[in-house]
Amino acid sequence: GITIPRNPGCPNSEDKNFPRTVMVNLNIHNRNTNTNPKRSSDYYNRSTSPWNLHRNEDPERYPSVIWEAKCRHLGCINADGNVDYHMNSVPIQQEILVLRREPPHCPNSFRLEKILVSVGCTCVTPIVHHVA
Amino acid sequence: GITIPRNPGCPNSEDKNFPRTVMVNLNIHNRNTNTNPKRSSDYYNRSTSPWNLHRNEDPERYPSVIWEAKCRHLGCINADGNVDYHMNSVPIQQEILVLRREPPHCPNSFRLEKILVSVGCTCVTPIVHHVA
């Protein structure tokens, strides 16, 4: 990996698990200042592979609320507005990092966790395997 | 929000910024044991709104590598394999949490940061604004 020169002003860590356990400031810095959150808000409805968003809530996780996409159809919407099975709607999934309270119910102690979430759906050409 | 009963075995925090600053174990727990990572690996190529994946690396961020999707076309691929501009390829974006080293170059001190990433692309019907 890349070696990072250590800043002499870094906090000290006496933790025996260091560098496994680190200090994290939860005061979130939002880098998305130039983005318009409205911009993609209706793609779920206008897509040829439309999806619904389901709320997944877990108070032991940070963030506690995550929205999961579920494709509305197995096929894709064609030019006539019909569901066409010659194409397939599939979820686009992404691995994201969340914080899991550990030990459980602790407000100030977490463990990083990797979870797979469905963000939206896309329309793909199916792979057809014919029987010989 | 939901009130979580405090676990008596929680680590103590003498930090004056508590609960802004928390302890995080970086030993990642992966919840994706039942998922097949191969399954969605070729969607980017088979989609009617195909995309390329670009590597975004930042040693001051955790995770340091993030893959960003960029739609290949403005239109969508039709049944003939041509780009059809009656439909639009658009990126599906998601806000994710990352850890930003703060102060810079510190191995054990971070701040949560929210960033917007493009995960893949979907094909949508364009919104047509006619001139009166």
Epitope: H73, L74, N82, V83, Y85, P126, H130 | R46
Partner: antibody
């Protein structure tokens, strides 16, 4: 308890349009699931005709597509089948069912026999 | 279109004995999302079909555990461990991964 009930004429003349309605009770057809029509000619097997999704889009059996229209009336919680230019080959028991588009047919109507004859 | 071929078309059985019905698709019915939408239905004379098994191997609620489904890709099987009188009727396999299609049916009858 979800219940489906087919209704419509039992006799249709050749070249005319067959029209059936399915009334659903115990579940809103616009809240979830696809809502399908399936038919069974006397002494033969089952054939999927098409569905209308809770969100509105339809899908039809390619072999019947040019003659089929499925629509709905959410205010009455009903969905309907229209099959045009019928022939004797369209004589069958017609069933409506909840399911299709990834969901199994878990609830069925009792079926209605439609005979095409002059 | 995907053609679903069942065998045998007629299956004479002795009550209390096992029975097995095969269903083969003309192409893979694994959807691009990784799921296989293969169901089994039982239709008794003069009645509407009833769902037994969904997504290859999942028993629908209320279905006795003597019914089991298995298979993958293009080859699927419905097994009844011990046939009871109430199991007699016509069994249909169904695929919903592509434009939906039923198999032609297998009649389970007393030997």
């Amino acid at each position: 308890q979800v219940q489906l009930q087919e209704s419509g004429p039992g006799l249709v003349k050749p070249s005319e349009t067959l029209s059936l309605t399915c009334t659903v009770t115990g579940y809103s057809i616009s809240s979830d699931y696809a809502w399908s029509w399936i038919r069974q000619p006397p002494g033969k097997g089952l054939e999927w005709i098409g569905f209308i999704s809770y969100s509105g889009p339809t899908s039809y059996n390619p072999s019947l597509k040019s003659r089929v229209t499925i629509s709905r009336d959410t205010s009455k919680n009903q969905f309907s089948l229209k099959l045009s230019s019928v022939t004797a080959a369209d004589t069958a028991v017609y069933y409506c069912a909840r399911g299709g588009d990834g969901d199994s047919f878990d609830y069925w109507g009792q079926g209605t026999l439609v005979t095409v004859s002059s | 279109d995907v053609v679903m071929t069942q065998s045998p078309l007629s299956l004479p059985v002795t009550l209390g004995q096992p029975a097995s019905i095969s269903c083969r698709s003309s192409q893979s019915i694994v959807h691009s999302n990784g799921n296989t939408y293969l169901d089994w239905y039982l239709q008794k004379p003069g009645k509407s079909p009833k769902l037994l098994i969904y997504k290859v191997s999942n028993r629908f609620s209320g279905v006795p555990d003597r019914f089991s489904g298995s298979g993958s890709g293009t080859d699927f099987t419905l097994k009844i461990s011990r046939v009871e009188a109430e199991d007699l009727g016509v069994y249909y396999c169904f695929q919903g991964s592509h434009f939906p299609t039923f198999g032609q049916g297998t009649k389970l009858e007393i030997k």
